[in-house]
Interface confidence: medium
């Protein structure tokens, strides 16, 4: 047979469908690999062929389109299951060809079981809602193309295992679920079950997504540097370890990149000829506000290092801020004999001002 452009196994499209539900799967060739659509290919005399490899088998075999009630069928560039069975799991290939042209791609299809509370190994999309932001909606995903607009399906919404009815702030509105005002207790998995008739049979589509309530843009502020601050002085003797934490609070901002970095004498630590290590930790609030801490560490600080300028910088989509750490060389306490000889008669020791020391 003639050479075929083989795009291999497209693992980017890990298609998961529920057992005993309809599934429509478009051939990925036209969506991601070729620059023309199915109609153009069909007009040019190209034929779309489907075959598959069962789970744990190497043998490619044709798809049986002659099953009772046309359980598996093809319509244009879509492979239909009405409905799926567990043993439909495998790698499916669609091949576009004529006598002079051939292109094919394979993709994995996993038929997944769910329990009565819609729990399953299905990877769930995440939808973020802003806390206390007014009415926001989620829409039952991936149901287009399953039934014509003349068919009026029934849609039931669930939170976890519970049918959504008489919830304080969540109202089902057909394909949409409206959150009058979103609270953190609205976090969770939401499932829409779409029921529609087709040729005397009733089919169900189950779609689950995860709602995560996040900080509202109306409450978002530029980064806030909690440390270093004016209350803390890093006073060290040469040879001691210098540890300065830079702790920054970032409001949640959709698609914002939160950055924290140190400069020493205006340069990145990598560009300074001293042995500096920086360790970062990140924590999140219940609304995905972020606290980043970068601890700057110099194991054995020198007198020269204690004269340098250490500045913590932070940036988000809301702005950029910076704060310098107050670093000083500790003045050794005068020895008692010297005190007497010099006639100071001091009773205390140290610098006479109050310091917090971070270790």
């Amino acid at each position: 047979s003639e050479r075929c452009d083989d795009w291999g196994l497209d693992t980017m499209r890990q298609i998961q469908v529920f057992e005993d539900e309809p599934a429509r799967i478009k051939c990925p060739l036209f969506e991601h690999f070729l620059k023309f659509n199915y109609s153009t290919a069909h007009s040019a005399g190209l034929t779309l062929i489907w075959y598959w490899t069962r789970q744990d088998r190497d043998l490619e075999e044709p798809i049986n389109f002659r099953l009772p009630e046309n359980r598996i069928s093809k319509e244009k560039d879509v492979l239909w299951f009405r409905p799926t069975l567990l043993n439909d799991t495998g790698n499916y290939t669609c091949m576009l060809r004529n006598t002079t042209y051939c292109s094919k791609v394979a993709f994995p299809l996993e038929v997944v079981q769910k329990d009565s509370c819609f729990n399953s190994p299905m990877k769930l999309p995440v939808h973020k809602l802003y806390i206390e932001y007014g009415i926001q909606r989620i829409t039952c995903p991936n149901v287009d193309g399953y039934f014509p607009s003349s068919v009026k399906p029934t849609i039931t919404w669930y939170m976890g295992c519970y049918k959504i009815q008489n919830f304080n702030n969540v109202i089902p509105e057909g394909m949409n679920l409206s959150f009058l005002i979103a609270f953190i207790s609205n976090n969770g998995n939401y499932t829409c079950v779409v029921t529609y008739p087709e040729n005397g049979r009733t089919f169900h589509l189950t779609r689950t997504l995860t709602v995560k309530v996040v900080g509202s843009p109306k409450n978002a502020v530029p980064p806030v540097i909690h440390s270093p601050n004016d209350h803390v002085v890093y006073e060290k003797e040469p040879g001691e370890e210098l540890l300065i934490p830079c702790t920054v609070y970032f409001s949640f901002l959709m698609d914002s990149r939160n950055e924290v970095w140190w400069t020493i004498d205006g340069k990145k630590p990598d560009d300074i000829p001293i042995d500096v290590t920086i360790n970062e930790s990140i924590s999140h609030s219940r609304t995905e506000d972020e606290t980043r801490t970068q601890i700057l560490s110099i194991k054995k600080v020198t007198s020269e290092d204690l004269k340098r300028s250490y500045v913590c910088h932070a940036r988000s989509a809301k702005g950029e801020v910076a704060k310098a750490a107050t670093v000083k060389q500790k003045v050794p306490a005068p020895r008692y004999t010297v005190e007497l000889a010099c006639g100071f008669g001091a009773t205390g020791s140290g610098s006479g001002s109050h310091h917090h020391h971070h270790h």
């Epitope: 806390i131 939170m159 976890g160 295992c161 304080n168 207790s185 909690h226 702790t247 609070y249 219940r286």
Partner: antibody, heavy 122, light 107 residues
């Protein structure tokens, strides 16, 4: 008026499992803006959050107790329960159940049970 | 975990005094802070939530302020029934944590 009432044994032997139930009256445990929590207070000491549950069964636990703690909810009985396994004398405390209200978006334990003193001793 | 440090631990005051209790968080918690009052042998009672919002039914002599890492509970004029232990609690992130408490005693 919402009320919470803890029930369960006041004495548990070391290495056994502590079991407490909180019965909610005057309101539904299935309200969509409430979490239900357990907090404990050793004699003469401060408060420690053990964990919280939502009516759907979703839980959050204090990492310091996570390996030993389990919180469950029974919406039909309007109750939620705490189980703490492998107890030691350090688990002796007054155990409170409480409602965490989210309707302001800011949370707080606005209703508490009267507390149940559990002593771990052989 | 977010640590909450309350100060002072003990406070002696007289009826009519203005009393201030401070709660410092180990990291920024926005306004996700509540204040509770606890009397011996009783469950804690919510006074303030969202750092500064007075819980329904709580006398207006109680007020809360602060945001980020520094928070304050103020009793403008101490009454006999206010002698108790006060706790702050952060609800910003899990695990939820409480301050160590401030005991307000009669001078």
């Amino acid at each position: 008026q919402l009320q919470l009432q803890e029930s369960g044994p006041g004495l548990v032997k070391p290495s056994e499992t502590l079991s407490l139930t909180c019965t909610v009256s005057g309101g539904s445990i299935s309200s969509s803006t409430y979490y239900w929590g357990w907090i404990r207070q050793p004699p003469g000491k401060g408060l420690e959050w053990i964990g919280s549950i939502y009516f759907t069964g979703s839980t959050d636990y204090n990492p310091s107790l996570k390996s030993r703690v389990s919180i469950s909810v029974d919406t039909s009985k309007n109750q939620f329960s705490l189980k703490l396994s492998s107890v030691t004398a350090a688990d002796t405390a007054v155990y409170y159940c409480a409602k965490e209200d989210d309707s302001s978006g800011y949370y707080s334990f606005d209703y508490w049970g009267q507390g149940n003193l559990v002593t771990v001793s052989s | 975990d977010i640590q909450l440090t309350q100060s002072p631990s003990f406070l002696s005051a007289s009826v009519g005094d203005r009393v201030t209790i401070t709660c410092r968080a180990s990291q920024g918690i926005s306004s996700y802070l509540a204040w509770y009052q606890q009397k011996p042998g009783k469950a804690p009672k919510l006074l303030i939530y969202a750092a500064s919002t007075l819980q329904s039914g709580v006398p207006s002599r109680f007020s809360g302020s602060g945001s980020g890492t520094e928070f304050t509970l103020t009793i403008s004029s101490l009454q006999p029934e206010d002698f108790a232990t006060y706790y702050c609690q952060q609800v910003n992130s899990y695990p939820l944590t409480f301050g160590g408490g401030t005991k307000v005693e009669i001078k």
